[in-house]
């Protein structure tokens, strides 16, 4: 199954510590999630206690559709995702989702072991989707590079990649994941220009296109392929809707993405 | 810098049960994932279980349905409890921590288990 997302009326506050947060959202999940017929996740009127980092954020996304999540430094997008994922718990409003999450951090991360185990490891091996997912993130130069191919050892002792290699492993594990929903967190991170044009296009476009994805991101380019847009501004929705609707603001909205 | 310290570690039963727990301490604010490897005499270390941001656990194919991986992120632990033990888990745990932008590693000292009748 894919999934829908709905968020109504969503506010949250960085009140405690991050791991007080994560436990009470876990033990009192009964305000964050609500069960949803329909396999939609939506936020309602949602924020936290203190000084709200989100405040009154409302979205939906259809099953299959990309939401991209813009806003300059500090305006809550990170805080949005940790919503979704239940690590952060609103103090009012409603989280609907259903199934399952994978999610790709903003600072990719390596674990010890071998570039395939990195991108499967714990997950069914699947050949035709593993060199898809390789393939769409473009790593198909990198791995072929390499004396041992996807067999080389990562960490200590073994090979150091690069950012933009890291970036991209990172990516496709999260990619890899069968999920209902995908969380991609600036997953471009380190990437040129045109390697970004084209893993957006290849992987997040193409083949991940009927998967429900929320994708945090500065670039015009990815705004204009989005389902929807959420702009954020100081952990407020500044504009919701659509690129054309966007476009016929009268007001200069890039100092709000840029960050 | 990280520091890990585990304990649990010990002799058991086949069938029998242990749970291993490891703290970090140091630079903790900046964790990207967090879990435990093994090595078996002989043997490379290999990955047993890992949790990552965004609640993702994920587990070798041999553990999976009797480890359960567990975090404490208000204390900075990770918690590891293996069930129905057999003989083939012997080995030296590890516990695993990687954190900061550009994806450090850090280690703890390991823990042996060793199960045996």
């Known amino acids: 199954t894919t999934t829908e997302v709905v968020m109504e009326n969503v506010t949250a506050f960085w009140e405690e510590g991050f791991g007080e947060l994560f436990e009470k959202a876990k033990q009192n999940n009964n305000n964050r999630k609500t069960s949803n017929g329909d396999d939609s996740l939506f936020f309602s009127n949602f924020s936290l206690l203190g000084t709200p980092v989100l405040k009154d954020i409302n979205f939906k996304i259809e099953r299959g559709q990309l939401l991209a999540v813009a806003g300059s430094t500090g305006a809550g997008k990170t805080s949005l995702l940790m919503m979704i994922m239940g690590e952060l718990e609103p103090s009012e409003g409603k989280i609907k989702h259903s199934g399952r999450i994978s999610f790709c951090p903003q600072f990719s991360w390596i674990m010890p072991g071998t570039i395939k185990e990195n991108i499967i490891f714990g997950v069914s091996y699947d050949e035709y989707r593993y060199r898809s997912v390789i393939k769409a993130c473009q790593l198909e130069e990198d791995i072929s590079k390499f004396p041992e191919k996807d067999n080389t050892v990562l960490g200590e002792g073994g090979i150091t990649l690069s950012g933009g290699q890291r970036a991209r492993i990172s990516l496709a594990r999260a990619v890899y994941k069968d999920a209902d929903l995908y969380l991609l967190d600036s997953p471009f991170g380190y990437l040129d220009v045109l390697t970004e044009k084209e893993i957006f296009e290849s992987c997040v476009c193409k083949l991940m296109a009927n998967k429900t994805r929320i994708l945090v991101t500065s670039k015009m380019e990815h705004l204009k392929k989005a389902d929807k847009i959420l702009i954020l501004h100081e952990g407020s929705s500044y504009f919701y809707g659509t690129f054309s609707e966007l476009q016929n603001l009268q007001p200069d909205f890039s100092s709000k993405l840029m960050g | 810098q990280v520091q890990l310290q585990e304990s649990g570690g010990g002799l058991v039963q086949p069938g029998g049960s242990l749970r291993l727990s490891c703290a970090a301490s140091?630079?903790?604010?900046?964790?990207?994932?967090m879990g435990w490897y093994r090595q078996a005499p002989g043997k490379q270390r290999e990955p047993v279980a890992i949790?990552?941001?965004?609640?993702?656990?994920r587990y070798a194919e041999p553990v999976k349905g009797r480890f359960t991986i567990s975090r404490d992120n208000a204390q900075n632990k990770v918690y590891l409890q293996m069930n129905s033990l057999k003989p083939e888990d012997t080995a030296v745990y590890y516990c695993?921590?990687?954190?900061?932008?550009?994806?450090?590693?850090?280690w703890g000292q390991g823990t042996q288990v060793t199960v045996s009748s």
């Open positions: 140091g630079s903790t604010s900046s964790i990207n994932a």
């Open positions: 695993w921590l990687n954190w900061g932008r550009t994806s450090v590693n850090s």
């Open positions: 949790s990552s941001s965004g609640g993702d656990t």
